[in-house]
Interface confidence: medium
């Protein structure tokens, strides 16, 4: 599936790239999937298409939805989908999980934190950087091009880092912020806030009624076998064992697997004989350890027997 999740905050700029790539000479048409309505290309519109890019200048919560892009060439058409979610600005400092970009790790030798998605924007230096909502100050922090360099990295440098920059479009300025977690690698082994590798946040899993379905919750917790780490599934906020549906079971035996030296755990949710009512449930993949809990939500949707995607 050529589908990509994108997210942003209301009143900030958001630029989304079509998940289907093509030559610059190919035309790209954008549509709002729910209505099949074409997205205009005129820059006077708040939301407009510009080749492979879809621009929200600025974004509004109501812009949330699935957008279709069709890359057209003389010989073929390629279709992609951009799942866009615009969130209200948080009043407090806490950046919710669903606004976080991928976690990056650093060590004494390498401590670059790249500002996520910045390459899509027309921005000028300098970038502003914040850690846990506090502006970074001191000679250890150096904003360099599109990344932050931290000198003499310590374990205390782990946290959530936000980059803030200005996107310029035809003389108008729009603010953009992006946040990602930074963890500090210790060659001795370390423990970190859980990072869920699968499923993606708010993933839609297509299933066939009457067939069996499997959902895998996979998360990493640090380096070395981790004590007090677990992954599990919940249905509508209830433990699987307490939910009382024998068709839906967790597969026990969370053996620790090591990917890139990281300690990771898997938990498979098996749904036998998928029923209509299963589509109404909220499936939460939970990963927890001493540092805290991370949750990714999955919903099921009915798979059409014949899919006409080009």
């Amino acid at each position: 599936k050529f589908s990509k999740q994108s997210w942003g905050l209301e009143n900030e700029a958001l630029i989304v790239r079509c998940p289907r790539q093509g030559k610059p000479s190919y035309t790209v048409d954008w549509y709002y999937s729910q209505t099949n309505k074409s997205i205009p290309t005129q820059e006077r519109n708040r939301v407009f298409a510009s080749g492979q890019l879809l621009k929200f200048l600025p974004a509004a919560v109501a812009d949330s939805g699935i957008y279709t892009c069709i890359v057209r060439s003389p010989t073929f058409n390629r279709t992609g989908y951009a799942n866009v979610t615009i969130y209200k600005k948080q009043s407090d400092c806490n950046v919710p999980d669903y606004l976080m970009y991928s976690t990056v790790s650093g060590s004494e030798k390498n401590s670059k934190i790249y500002c996520p998605t910045i390459d899509l924007y027309n921005w000028t230096a300098p970038l502003e950087w914040f850690k846990n909502c506090q502006a970074l100050q001191g000679s250890r922090y150096r904003a360099h091009k599109s990344f932050l360099v931290i000198d003499n990295v310590m374990t205390e440098d782990a946290g959530d880092y936000t980059c803030k920059f200005i996107h310029n479009e035809n003389g108008a300025n729009y603010s953009v912020t992006a946040t990602r977690s930074f963890t500090v690698k210790d060659e001795q082994g370390f423990s970190l806030f859980p990072v869920i590798g699968a499923p993606a946040q708010n993933e839609i899993k297509e299933v066939e009624i009457g067939k069996n379905a499997n959902l895998t919750c996979s998360a990493c917790f640090g380096k070395g076998t981790q004590f007090l780490a677990a992954v599990l599934w919940q249905l509508n906020g209830t433990k699987i064992t307490d939910f009382g549906e024998p068709r839906i079971q967790q597969e026990e035996g969370q053996n620790q697997s090591f990917s890139n030296g990281l300690a990771c755990l898997d938990m498979v949710l098996r749904i036998a004989d998928v029923k209509e009512e299963d589509l109404l449930l909220q499936y939460d993949c939970l990963a927890l350890n001493l540092h805290g809990l991370r949750r990714h939500t999955v919903r099921l949707s009915r798979k059409n027997p014949i899919d006409h995607h080009s």
Epitope: T155, A158, D186, Q188, G189, F190, S191, L192, G222, K223, G224, T225, Q226, F227, L228, A230, L232, Q234, K239, L286, L288, L290, H291, L293
Partner: antibody, heavy 121, light 106 residues
Framework: EVQLLESGGGLVQPGGSLRLSCAAS????????MSWVRQAPGKGLEWVSA????????YYADSVKGRFTISRDNSKNTLYLQMNSLRAEDTAVYYC??????????????WGQGTLVTVSS | DIQMTQSPSSLSASVGDRVTITCKAS??????LTWYQQKPGKAPKLLIY???KRPSGVPSRFSGSGSGTDFTLTISSLQPEDFATYYC????????FGQGTKVEIK
């Protein structure tokens, strides 16, 4: 001041059951993993079980798996250990311990005074 | 499970002495090592965590070092209140404790 107060220990016959409680005060109970550690008379320390903040995940030593159940009631700031099918080798002082948060693994930073469980016929 | 072996199992020392207790893990445990002090009839007390970190309230004469499989607890100048049993514990995997080292008055 952090305080942990265990209760529920006593003499029980092999095969019997006992429920230990640990009343916590002086800290935000729901923010911490909690654990039980035991110490047989004149012996060293043995980790028994642990539970996550909201009780979603539980962990057990192989020696007690299937016989002991750890649980918690955050509204009452209380940790429990339900012990079934008790054996003579379960005789020990049982300590309730708080697990500190941090990237350096699970250290038990505060301990209760312990409650003695004696399994004997 | 990872086995933790302490040495010596007991030692006699005088006030003011420098005391060293070692703890060896059967497998690599990184820095996930903790030391506790226990006095007779009392609960254990956290002394050192994360191999070398001291909680507030623990005197600076207590220090920890080592990494991987070999660790050391050092008391730079033994005080009367330090006569007790000391345990190491790993939490790299399911927690296990050393058998203890009893520090007695010479």
């Amino acid at each position: 001041e952090v305080q942990l107060l265990e209760s529920g220990g006593g003499l029980v016959q092999p095969g019997g059951s006992l429920r230990l409680s640990c009343a916590a005060s002086g800290f935000t109970f729901s923010s911490y993993f909690m654990s039980w550690v035991r110490q047989a008379p004149g012996k060293g320390l043995e980790w028994v079980s642990a539970i996550s903040r909201e009780g979603r995940a539980t962990y057990y030593a192989d020696s007690v798996k299937g016989r002991f159940t750890i649980s918690r009631d955050n509204s009452k700031n209380t940790l429990y250990l339900q012990m079934n099918s008790l054996r003579a080798e379960d005789t020990a002082v049982y300590y309730c311990a708080r697990i500190r948060v941090g990237p350096s693994g699970g250290a038990f930073d505060y301990w209760g005074q312990g409650t003695l469980v004696t399994v004997s016929s | 499970d990872i086995q933790m072996t302490q040495s010596p199992s007991s030692l006699s020392a005088s006030v003011g002495d420098r005391v060293t207790i070692t703890c060896k893990a059967s497998d690599h445990i990184g820095k996930f090592l903790t030391w506790y002090q226990q006095k007779p009839g009392k609960a254990p007390k956290l002394l050192i965590y994360g191999r070398n970190k001291r909680p507030s309230g623990v005197p600076s004469r207590f220090s920890g070092s080592g990494s991987g499989t070999d660790f050391t607890l050092t008391i730079s100048s033994l005080q009367p209140e330090d006569f007790a049993t000391y345990y190491c514990q790993q939490s790299y995997s399911t927690p296990t404790f050393g058998q203890g080292t009893k520090v007695e008055i010479k």
